[in-house]
């Protein structure tokens, strides 16, 4: 992807040097418009057949400094009667996200990009029954 | 959070200037180890009672340039018989992620942080029945 643009106005840049030292504006913009979050109902975590809880993960040297992580409430799914269904498993949907971590003791301050795997919510899947050979 | 470190070696900084110009190393580190992705079974999207498909969202001026976005396959959930259950809705679980967008025409090239709301997977919730007054 054209992350390293080349133009007549910019001298050629070694990719490796470029990647290790880019300037970033940390003032956050919404790429999907101001109303972006209104489309995210917050009650799915309770209403789902595979309900989850959210835990606040804090790291003062990370940007974002707070990330909410999901954990499934049960190993099984909840059926229409509100009982746990032993044929169905509640599983965590995870996503790999990018975060910025401050380099220790850096001055002027620099960050490095890190990948982090976070739980976002849970879904219900049929248990896989292992058949005897 | 300690986004703006102050030490005896670093002079005071106006927050707004700081946030608009930090240095970032874009060489990606895994905060959870090299095998991070291997813990994400990719068959949930087919096995779930609220299955989903993944679509490739590409933007050459974004870091990461490729993001996979989920879309629920059905409006309803799939029951044990493989039929759609009209009492249960398949809903998209979304997460706000951080991406870096290249500032147009910037030279030397700079990025700004953007928030993006992406679909990660789907979950099954009971339909809300609107009661007549």
């Amino acid at each position: 992807a054209a992350i390293i643009p080349q133009s007549s106005a910019c001298p050629n840049t070694e990719a490796k040097d470029f990647l290790q030292n880019v300037k970033v504006n940390l003032k956050v913009f919404n790429s999907l418009g101001a109303k972006v979050s209104s489309r995210r109902p917050s009650d799915y975590l309770n209403r789902s057949t595979s309900p989850w809880t959210l835990h606040r993960n804090e790291d003062p040297d990370r940007y974002p400094s707070v990330i909410w992580e999901a954990q499934c409430r049960h190993q099984r799914c909840v059926n229409a009667e509100g009982k746990l269904d032993h044929h169905m498993n509640s599983v965590l949907i995870q996503q790999e996200i990018l975060v910025l971590k401050r380099e220790p003791e850096s001055c002027p301050f620099t960050f490095r990009v890190e990948k982090m795997l976070v739980g976002v919510g849970c879904t219900c899947v049929a248990s896989i029954v292992r058949q005897a050979a | 959070a300690a986004i703006i470190p102050q030490s005896s070696a670093c002079p005071n900084t106006e927050a707004k200037d700081f946030l608009q110009n930090v240095k970032v190393n874009l060489k990606v580190f895994n905060s959870l180890g090299a095998k991070v992705s291997s813990r994400r079974p990719s068959d949930y999207l087919n096995r779930s009672t609220s299955p989903w498909t993944l679509h490739r969202n590409e933007d050459p001026d974004r870091y990461p340039s490729v993001i996979w976005e989920a879309q629920c396959r059905h409006q309803r959930c799939v029951n044990a018989e493989g039929k759609l259950d009209h009492h249960m809705n398949s809903v998209l679980i979304q997460q706000e992620i951080l991406v870096l967008k290249r500032e147009p025409e910037s030279c030397p090239f700079t990025f700004r942080v953007e928030k993006m709301l992406v679909g990660v997977g789907c979950t099954c919730v009971a339909s809300i029945v609107r009661q007549a007054a």
Partner: antibody, heavy 119, light 107 residues
Framework: QVQLQQSGAELVRPGASVKLSCKAS????????IHWVKQTPVHGLAWIGV????????AYNQKFKDKATLTADKSSSTAYMELSSLTSEDSAVYYC????????????WGQGTTLTVSS | SIVMTQTPKFLLVSAGDRVTITCKAS??????VAWYQHKPGQSPKLLIN???NRYTGVPDRFTGSGYGTDFTFTISTVQAEDLAIYFC?????????FGGGTKLEIK
């Protein structure tokens, strides 16, 4: 401009419950956490807990876990804190404040709600 | 939890004076300290975040400094409208904790 408008003063009996509100305006309610803080002359300011209206997540100071319940209604951009089994120790001024999860600091506060618990 | 010890509790000063308030954290909080001004009948207002960064629209007579455990808030030339309670808060991690406040009175 950003505003957090809190409900008016409350006088309640011991043993009862009360629900305080914090109505947000001037920004997208779902994008920021709302935190609650208790202020008394003796103990000063104490952090109670947080709710993220966007995802429904809550976290509490252990000291208030059995006392406070935080909720939010996105349709009215309002955060609520319910305090239960009230005693005179719960008499205080309660504030809501907005927290920026990316940058990691609090920027706006409500004007406070005075709660008096008395028979 | 982290204890924030703020001194002094009261300050009686004249307009034009220089005022210094300190906050000491019981453990390192990096630079995750904010300073607020609370006037009677109003909402507390953020003056300084990240220990030393003046918040948008805050007059430059208000400054902050410090890192780790020791933090200082200064009003270089006190004005009559600065009558208020000033307090620090650590936003390093929950439970977020506060200094006891300093009541500034003008002679």
């Amino acid at each position: 401009q950003v505003q957090l408008q809190q409900s008016g003063a409350e006088l309640v009996r011991p043993g009862a419950s009360v629900k305080l509100s914090c109505k947000a305006s001037g920004y997208t309610f779902s994008d920021y956490e709302i935190h609650w803080v208790k202020q008394t002359p003796v103990h000063g300011l104490a952090w109670i807990g947080v709710i993220h209206p966007g995802n429904g997540g809550t976290a509490y100071n252990q000291k208030f876990k059995d006392k406070a319940t935080l909720t939010a209604d996105k349709s009215s951009s309002t955060a609520y804190m319910e305090l239960s089994s009230l005693t005179s120790e719960d008499s205080a001024v309660y504030y809501c404040e907005r927290f920026l999860t990316y940058e990691g600091y609090f920027d706006y506060w409500g004007q406070g709600t005075t709660l008096t618990v008395s028979s | 939890s982290i204890v924030m010890t703020q001194t002094p509790k009261f300050l009686l000063v004249s307009a034009g004076d220089r005022v210094t308030i300190t906050c000491k954290a019981s453990q390192s909080v990096n630079n995750d300290v904010a300073w607020y001004q609370h006037k009677p009948g109003q909402s507390p207002k953020l003056l300084i975040n990240y220990a030393s960064n003046r918040y948008t629209g805050v007059p430059d007579r208000f400054t902050g400094s410090g890192y780790g455990t020791d933090f200082t808030f200064t009003i270089s030339t006190v004005q009559a409208e600065d009558l208020a309670i000033y307090f620090c808060q650590q936003d390093y991690g929950s439970p977020y904790t506060f200094g006891g406040g300093t009541k500034l009175e003008i002679k």
